[in-house]
């Protein structure tokens, strides 16, 4: 006879999986809030800053009620991938001024990467359709000046904060429906 069968594979509780994703998202939200505050102290923002290459905010708080789990996770993953790419770009091309935000910017990048892996795992555990491979994104142009890099940093951290805030609310709401 062959080897004894292994223990039956326990299907993870989706609520527990979502809990752990919420915790990671909330932790990253706090990191982003604190880093954005540090940036504002070092380089005060003169008004709101936008970056055309950033994703538009996925959902207003008022529209959360209509959310469905696959759509939320797919959209969140796509948006966070874009923010990860922008943070990497900022660290690489942001200029010497933004070096004062290290190692925090590096920590943020690592945690963003970890959250993306957690979302991927959650989608596979919940047997959700896997999104197609990401098409290669066009390279981001380097900032035109040191202040261009700082303005981009304000836009990236501000947008990431809004996205993560939306994500925490959305994930908590979805958890009540599981």
């Amino acid at each position: 006879p062959g080897p004894p069968p292994g223990p039956p594979r326990v299907s993870p509780d989706p609520r527990a999986e979502l809990d752990s994703t919420v915790l990671l998202t909330r932790s990253l939200l706090a990191d982003t809030r604190q880093l954005a505050a540090q940036l504002r102290d070092k380089f005060p923002a003169d008004g709101d800053h936008n970056l055309d290459s950033l994703p538009t905010l996925a959902m207003s708080a008022g529209a959360l009620g209509a959310l469905q789990l696959p759509g939320v996770l797919t959209r969140l993953r796509a948006d966070l991938l874009s923010y990860l790419r922008h943070v990497q770009w900022l660290r690489r091309a942001g200029g010497s001024s933004l070096k004062t935000l290290e190692p925090e910017l590096g920590t943020l990048q690592a945690r963003l990467d970890r959250l993306l892996r957690r979302l991927q795992l959650l989608m596979s555990r919940l047997a959700l359709p896997q999104p197609p491979p990401d098409p290669p994104a066009p390279p981001l142009a380097p900032p035109s000046s040191a202040w261009g890099g700082i303005r981009a940093a304000h836009a990236i951290l501000g947008g990431l904060h809004l996205t993560l805030d939306w994500a925490v609310r959305g994930l908590l709401l979805l958890k009540t429906r599981l």
């Epitope: 809990d19 915790l23 932790s27 706090a30 990191d31 809030r33 604190q34 954005a36 504002r40």
Partner: antibody, heavy 120, light 108 residues
Framework: EVQLVESGGGLVQPGGSLRLSCAAS????????MHWVRQAPGKGLEWVAY????????YYADTVKGRFTISRDNAKNSLYLQMNSLRAEDTAVYYC?????????????WGQGTLVTVSS | EIVLTQSPATLSLSPGERATLSCSVS???????LHWYQQKPGQAPRLLIY???NLASGIPARFSGSGSGTDFTLTISSLEPEDFAVYYC?????????FGQGTKLEIK
């Protein structure tokens, strides 16, 4: 040794104003975010306001928003709380507190507190 | 707003006994943002534990913290006379920063 000393408390009538100060020493004041926390007589702790080292990010509790203003003068190693339109429910001991680091690790250092009494 | 609920409101124990204080959080929070304070009458609060389980500087090893998600615990392994005080938990992950209502630890 880190030291925080509050002053400026006292008796004020409802609708009146008061300005609290917190003198800091024993650390590089300009490197740390600062908080005000209050405690009504016989009650628990309530966070009031927070200001980052460079004063560019400020948060308030909803109960004081629009009435209280937190500020700081890094050259004087001082933190302030301007309190306007005071109400009876603002009666409390007001503490200034320093964050442990820029990434939240709690209110690591506290002053001894200054009592504000709002009464007619 | 994240609400913290402490239990019991009052805990009556004798020196040498073990004390277990609970803090229940209305929302999931990462453990690194949950802190515990001790306050004695007429004194300012003192940070005991930060990040749910890290002992603050100068705090005796009989104090320990644990927990994750929504349920956190402060344990005093063997009570000393100076440990009788009010204990508060606090979250720093979300603005407004909030405290629990406190647990009064009194001598039996």
């Amino acid at each position: 040794e880190v030291q925080l000393v509050e002053s400026g408390g006292g008796l004020v009538q409802p609708g009146g104003s008061l300005r609290l100060s917190c003198a800091a020493s024993g650390f590089t004041f300009s490197s740390f975010g600062m908080h005000w926390v209050r405690q009504a007589p016989g009650k628990g702790l309530e966070w009031v306001a927070y200001i980052t080292p460079g004063s560019n990010t400020i948060y308030y509790a909803d109960t004081v928003k629009g009435r209280f203003t937190i500020s700081r003068d890094n050259a004087k190693n001082s933190l302030y709380l301007q309190m306007n339109s005071l109400r009876a429910e603002d009666t409390a001991v007001y503490y200034c507190a320093r964050e442990y680091s820029s990434y939240d690790e709690g209110f690591a250092y506290w002053g001894q507190g200054t009592l504000v009494t709002v009464s007619s | 707003e994240i609400v913290l609920t402490q239990s019991p409101a009052t805990l009556s124990l004798s020196p040498g006994e073990r004390a277990t204080l609970s803090c229940s959080v209305s929302d999931l929070i990462p453990s690194q943002y949950l802190h515990w304070y001790q306050q004695k009458p007429g004194q300012a609060p003192r940070l005991l534990i930060y990040g749910a389980s890290n002992l603050a500087s100068g705090i005796p090893a009989r104090f320990s913290g644990s927990g994750s998600g929504t349920d956190f615990t402060l344990t005093i392994s063997s009570l000393e006379p100076e440990d009788f005080a009010v204990y508060y938990c606090q979250q720093g992950v979300d603005v407004p920063f909030t405290f629990g209502q406190g647990t009064k630890l009194e001598i039996k």
